[in-house]
């Protein structure tokens, strides 16, 4: 139940990331740690790296408010779950600083990719026989 709630939140975050991708030119062009090809059992650790990253509005134009609201939503902490707690204690996961740094566009693309991976794993874990490759 708690894990389900978590994944529903991930699905909503995908929409927020997609919205922010429309405003990449209005974001500070800073390079941010962007996990990619995250190893199994380190997904929550990587997720927290994305949430901690200092994504910022460039404070230009009319989009500042909508961008800041979206960034705030991205940073909202999800409810704690056993899976998340278990992974928190995995000392083998890379630190946030060890991930390659990318500009906002690639940062958001990689964030979305991680969210999709987590939802797909969740969906597949409830199902048998439809995974082909």
């Amino acid at each position: 139940q708690g894990q389900d709630r978590h994944m529903i939140r991930m699905r909503q975050l995908i929409d927020i990331v997609d919205q922010l991708k429309n405003y990449v030119n209005d974001l500070v062009p800073e390079f941010l740690p962007a996990p990619e090809d995250v190893e199994t059992n380190c997904e929550w650790s990587a997720f927290s790296c994305f949430q901690k990253a200092q994504l910022k509005s460039a404070n230009t134009g009319n989009n500042e408010r909508i961008i800041n609201v979206s960034i705030k939503k991205l940073k909202r902490k999800p409810p704690s779950t056993n899976a998340g707690r278990r992974q928190k204690h995995r000392l083998t996961c890379p630190s946030c600083d060890s991930y390659e740094k990318k500009p906002p566009k690639e940062f958001l693309e990689r964030f979305k990719s991680l969210l999709q991976k987590m939802i797909h794993q969740h969906l597949s874990s409830r199902t048998h026989g439809s995974e082909d490759s």
Epitope: Q1, R11, I14, D18, I119, S130, S133
Partner: antibody, heavy 117, light 107 residues
Framework: QVQLQESGPGLVKPSETLSLTCTVS????????WGWIRQPPGKGLEWIGY???????NYNPSLKSRVTISVDTSRNQFSLKLSSVTAADTAVYYC???????????WGQGTLVTVSS | DIQLTQSPSSVSASVGDRVTITCRAS??????LAWYQHKPGKAPKLLIY???SLQSGVPSRFSGSGSGTDFTLTISSLQPEDFATYYC?????????FGGGTKVEIK
């Protein structure tokens, strides 16, 4: 705005292979999930399967033995092959994007494929 | 497979009416339900995902609710462009499945 367009023959003979291509414009196929859904005349929608940008696939078990979905990132296209077709495979075939992994936010208009000799 | 049963299969309504469509799942699917609008010859359109989240660009007269096995799509004030067939889809487990559809017709 992402747009999808199905293309392929509208008539396929029984026992042959149905082949359709979906061309994606207004966005890159190198992220998200890309799926096929069909609707037989007068019936509901049926999910056929999908492929991720990395090439991993999920198929409907009822069709799995006959279905292949592949992706061509260089052409921004993905394809459906359905082998050994029968009249029951006559349907409007839709391609669609799934950003959320399990729901479909952009669809093509659909293409009618009739299986008949 | 998870079966989805929509009711009613069709509904006649007038512009300005409040329309409610229900979708019942054969087993609990938490909030993993989407709603689509489909007009003949057009591409289906995602309205609602995870039971109650409004897809970007969809008018606020559309709303979704429910969890577990019982879900509802509500159109608060029917507009001329809303006459179409509506489908629910479960996103809880593979294979992804759709309801049989509800046709909203002009009274």
């Amino acid at each position: 705005q992402v747009q999808l367009q199905e293309s392929g023959p509208g008539l396929v003979k029984p026992s042959e292979t149905l082949s359709l291509t979906c061309t994606v414009s207004g966005g890159s196929i190198s992220s998200d999930y890309w799926g096929w859904i069909r609707q037989p005349p007068g019936k509901g929608l049926e999910w056929i399967g999908y492929i991720s940008s990395s090439g991993s696939t999920n198929y409907n078990p009822s069709l799995k033995s006959r279905v292949t979905i592949s992706v061509d990132t260089s052409r921004n296209q993905f394809s459906l092959k359905l082998s050994s077709v029968t009249a029951a495979d006559t349907a409007v075939y839709y391609c669609a994007r799934s950003a959320g992994v399990a729901d479909f936010d952009f669809w093509g208009q659909g293409t009618l494929v009739t299986v008949s000799s | 497979d998870i079966q989805l049963t929509q009711s009613p299969s069709s509904v006649s309504a007038s512009v300005g009416d409040r329309v409610t469509i229900t979708c019942r799942a054969s087993q609990g699917i938490s909030s993993w339900l989407a709603w689509y609008q489909h007009k003949p010859g057009k591409a289906p359109k995602l309205l609602i995902y995870v039971a109650s989240s409004l897809q970007s660009g969809v008018p606020s007269r559309f709303s979704g609710s429910g969890s577990g096995t019982d879900f509802t799509l509500t159109i608060s004030s029917l507009q001329p462009e809303d006459f179409a067939t509506y489908y629910c889809q479960q996103a809880s487990s593979f294979p992804l499945t759709f309801g049989g559809g509800t046709k909203v017709e002009i009274k």
